[in-house]
Interface confidence: low
């Protein structure tokens, strides 16, 4: 063999014994008769030896270094050749090392061609047995930047002020270029910036500076992910540790697209974001440590590049052409752990705006979509006002309080959907007919439906909730005097098996002055249970409920109140309660304030119930839960 | 390959009533939703609504509400649209056609059964 | 509802002409504006979505251009197993509609 290096070529070529194995026969270079087991040839030089033996490849390895200085004069950068070439050199296990100095100032940039590389973590290898290590430097420290093979995403490698770059070739293997050039670029003012291209679906996995070591102190490394638009990536943590740190916080910062927040700031424990769209960057930054107790910085991690899940490539189409005064607003759903970060969850106008809540208006035809892991993280909250400004135009007129098909078939759950229902002051009161008699929730006989709906007065002034409400049970229709919101809240996601038990509707009608009148049609032998509106916090002052209960003829009601007291304390007025039988007129006035609340009374005929409030003082105000049980009328009670 | 295969042609009485079937192949019926289409003979295409293959839940033209039902059995891939009370102005081709993912346009559609509805 | 006029009712062409066709709606309904042909005795096929969509397994031949409320099919050159009735559907909102066809004939 004969080796021959140019002067000034700057190159180094050492021929030495590998790793020791277990053959009998030892093997030598020989040269001038000599026989040695290590040979240095410099730039310049020219020298011609030869082996003892037939496979000098199971005993000897050649290291062919390239020092480049870009401190002392113009790099030389470009495409990086393999010098010597290769079919001039021995067929040894062989590794080309190029040790690039330059100015901190400087950034220099390993491209490499397709294939790009793949970064292996401690005690992996390369299928082909092709390994890239390449280093990095700050000051006089070097810093393993990572070992990659072949077949990967890694298209790029900026660092600045050096880069040692080693290319291990087996000795079989064929292969006679380097496969990568050297640019130079402005100071990147940080440890290394790694490339990754996704060109389809795929994953790459990725480590720290000096993994499994520490990271350096106080560095910054960037990894730059090139994702097509179509696609989807995810990134998870597969292992990290976290040094003691004495100032600053060890933390990952990414710039996402869509994210009106960049960079997106999140601790190492913290869920990583997924499911993003588009080209990003991931930042790990370390801290000042602990001089005693220092610890280690460091990441193992791995992007997933797939096709959108699930919802995410459909269009959905929703038709509020047809609506007046409305508004539909997607949202992600209030989560407990504030300070932990989940993956991104977008929902897109024409596929086009994402973001993390969305509001769509009346009057026009929308096409969303969504960009989101888990579409259970996310909710619908609707608003649709129908107002009557003249009484006469909307007397009697009535209207269905029902959640249009389109947004049923959303994937997104319906929290809310909340009508608000206006009318002339002092003109016009509002009936609310179910399609299924309702039923109030209480304590003691909750709702298990899986919506109610919520009637509480719309006047910013009065604090008045008239209570929630499920299909299923008795109050067949509930009149209220004046403006309220009706919302209905679903609970489960049953709510689109069930959505055809939802219907209501409300009428406008002749105005009256009594704040909410109910209409109950008990069945036999269910129990109806009745609270007063503003529950807990009491029935607000001078204000009159009324609940109208029908007894069929064959049937008996008892009427029966769950407490001795009401407990109110008037500070003016009296709070009294009306009971009064229908076909006789007979009625019995109670004293709240004052009298006792009436021992469990029979009632053979339909009858009124009305509370009226004082003006309580504060503390004692006015609750009261009723209850109305039938009976068959077997025998005569009176 | 994706195919919609509706029943056969049906002749009924005034009054009657008439079951039609469509069954969905060559792709998962709960992916797309599933229209309803009536073209009356010599006349154009009306559009008579749609049923959420999701949820089961349909949806009416104003024109077909009452007398017209559409329903499902996923298990074996089959949109059904049934027809009471039938009027001799029920005549026509009855089509089923698929919905691209709740957009609606129909990429696919049935053959198309034929109902008369003579005395 | 909205409601699609077509033009012509007939239009009579030889083939290898140019065949034009016209769908009006009756208010602005953006591109939400499909096309099928018709040929007799034979279900309804989509020719173009949203306009101007083209559909794989669609000649190249059949075009679609517009937006708001006039609409137009082209058929750069008639072939023979053209000719067919033509609807434009409307998916602008509930019901959705069909117009009343335009009928492409031999001349």
């Known amino acids: 063999f004969e080796i021959a290096l140019p002067r000034e070529s700057n190159i180094t070529v050492l021929i030495k014994l590998g790793t020791p194995t277990l053959l009998a026969k030892p093997c030598y270079i020989v040269i001038s008769k000599r026989h040695i087991t290590m040979l240095s040839i410099k730039s310049g030089e020219r020298i011609v030896f030869t082996f003892s033996c037939q496979s000098p490849e199971n005993h000897f390895v050649i290291e062919i270094q390239k020092n480049i200085d870009c401190m002392s004069g113009p790099c030389p950068f470009g495409e990086v050749q393999l010098q010597p070439s290769t079919s001039l050199l021995p067929t040894l296990n062989r590794t080309f090392i190029w040790d690039v100095k330059a100015h901190k100032s400087i950034g220099l940039e390993l491209q490499f061609s397709i294939p790009r590389l793949r970064q292996i973590g401690p005690g992996e290898s390369c299928p082909d047995g092709v390994t890239h290590s390449i280093s990095g430097r700050i000051d006089a420290t070097v810093v393993r930047i990572g070992t990659f093979c072949s077949n990967g995403t890694v298209s790029r490698i900026k660092m600045q002020e050096g880069v040692k770059m080693a290319l291990h070739l087996p000795w079989f293997h064929p292969r006679n270029v380097s496969g990568f050039s050297i640019a130079n670029r402005s100071s990147i003012k940080r440890l290394c910036i790694i490339e990754s291209v996704f060109e389809g679906e795929g994953s790459a996995t990725l480590m720290s500076a000096n993994y499994p070591e520490g990271f350096p102190e106080d560095e910054l490394m960037t990894w730059q992910f090139v994702v097509p638009a179509h696609l989807r990536a995810s990134v998870s943590f597969l292992n990290f540790n976290l040094s003691n740190c004495e100032r600053k916080e060890e933390r990952v910062e990414y710039y996402i697209p869509g994210s009106t927040t960049n960079p997106e700031v999140f601790k190492l424990e913290d869920k990583q974001p997924g499911n993003m769209a588009g080209n990003f960057n991931l930042s790990l930054q370390g801290c000042d440590q602990d001089a005693q107790s220092p610890g280690i910085l460091r990441l193992q991690f791995q992007v997933l590049v797939q096709h959108p899940q699930n919802e995410s490539n459909k269009i959905y189409v929703v038709d509020l052409s047809n609506e007046r005064a409305m508004s539909l607003t997607i949202e992600p759903r209030p989560v407990k752990q504030s300070r932990k970060f989940v993956p991104g969850c977008f929902v897109c106008l024409e596929s086009r705006t994402c973001s993390s809540n969305l509001t769509l208006t009346s009057g026009s035809k929308h096409k969303i979509s969504f960009l989101c892991d888990d579409l259970t993280r996310l909710w619908m909250n609707v608003e649709k006002t129908i107002s009557c400004t003249d009484h006469r135009y909307c007397q009697r007129k009535s209207y269905s309080l029902q959640v249009p098909s389109d947004i049923l078939h959303l994937p997104v759950e319906l929290h809310d959907f909340s009508w608000k229902l206006l009318v002339p002051k002092d003109r016009l009161s509002l009936v609310l007919v179910p399609a299924q008699k309702l039923q109030q929730h209480t304590h003691e006989k909750p709702c298990n439906t899986s919506f109610s709906y919520l009637v509480a007065s719309a006047i910013p002034s009065q604090d008045l909730y008239f209570g929630s409400f499920c299909p299923g049970g008795s109050i067949k229709q509930i009149q209220v005097k004046q403006n309220i919101s009706v919302t209905l809240r679903t609970f489960a996601p049953s709510f689109q098996q069930e959505a055809s038990r939802q219907g209501l509707t409300v009428s406008f009608i002749p105005y009256f002055k009594e704040e909410g009148v109910f209409t109950v049609t008990p069945d036999t032998k269910s129990k109806v249970y009745l609270r007063t509106p503003n529950w807990d916090r009491g029935l607000p002052s001078l204000t009159s409920v009324s609940w109208n209960i029908s007894v069929p003829r064959d049937q008996v009601a008892c009427l029966t109140f769950f407490k001795e007291r009401s407990g109110v304390v008037c500070q003016t007025g009296r709070a009294f309660m009306i009971i009064q039988e229908q076909r006789t007129r007979a009625e019995e006035i109670f004293s709240l304030d004052e009298d006792v609340l009436p021992k469990p009374s029979f009632h053979h005929h339909s009858f009124w119930v009305n509370i009226s409030n004082c003006s309580p003082t504060s503390g004692k105000q006015l609750d009261l839960l009723f209850s109305v049980t039938l009976t068959p009328r077997t025998v005569d009670l009176t | 390959q994706v195919q919609l295969q509706q029943s056969g042609s049906e002749l009924k009485k005034p009054g009657e009533s008439v079951k039609l079937s469509c069954k969905a192949s060559?792709?998962?019926?709960?992916?797309?939703?599933m229209h309803w289409v009536r073209q009356a003979p010599g006349q154009g295409l009306k559009w008579m609504g749609w049923?959420?293959?999701?949820?089961?839940?349909?949806t009416y033209a104003d024109d077909f509400k009452g007398r017209f039902v559409f329903s499902l059995d996923t298990s074996v891939s089959m949109a059904y649209l049934q027809i009471s009370s039938l009027k001799s102005e029920d005549t026509a081709v009855y089509y089923c056609?698929?919905?691209?993912?709740?957009?609606?346009?129909?990429?696919?559609w049935g053959q198309g059964t034929l109902v008369t509805v003579s005395s | 509802e909205i409601v699609l006029t077509q033009s012509p009712a007939t239009l009579s062409l030889s083939p290898g002409e140019r065949a034009t066709l016209s769908c009006r709606a009756s208010?602005?309904?953006?591109?939400?504006l499909h096309w099928y042909q018709q040929k007799s005795g034979q279900s309804p096929r989509l020719l173009i979505k949203?306009?101007?969509q083209s559909i794989s397994g669609i000649p190249a031949r059949f075009s679609g251009s517009g937006s708001g409320s006039d609409f137009t099919l082209t058929i750069s050159s008639v072939e023979p197993e053209d000719f067919a009735v033509y609807y434009c559907?409307?998916?602008?909102?509930?019901?959705?509609?069909f117009g009343q066809g335009t009928k492409l004939e031999i001349k």
């Open positions: 056609s698929r919905g691209r993912d709740y957009d609606p346009h129909f990429d696919y």
């Open positions: 060559g792709y998962t019926l709960t992916d797309f939703s």
């Open positions: 049923i959420n293959t999701e949820t089961g839940a349909p």
């Open positions: 208010q602005s309904i953006s591109d939400f």
């Open positions: 949203y306009a101007s």
């Open positions: 559907q409307s998916a602008h909102s509930f019901p959705y509609t």
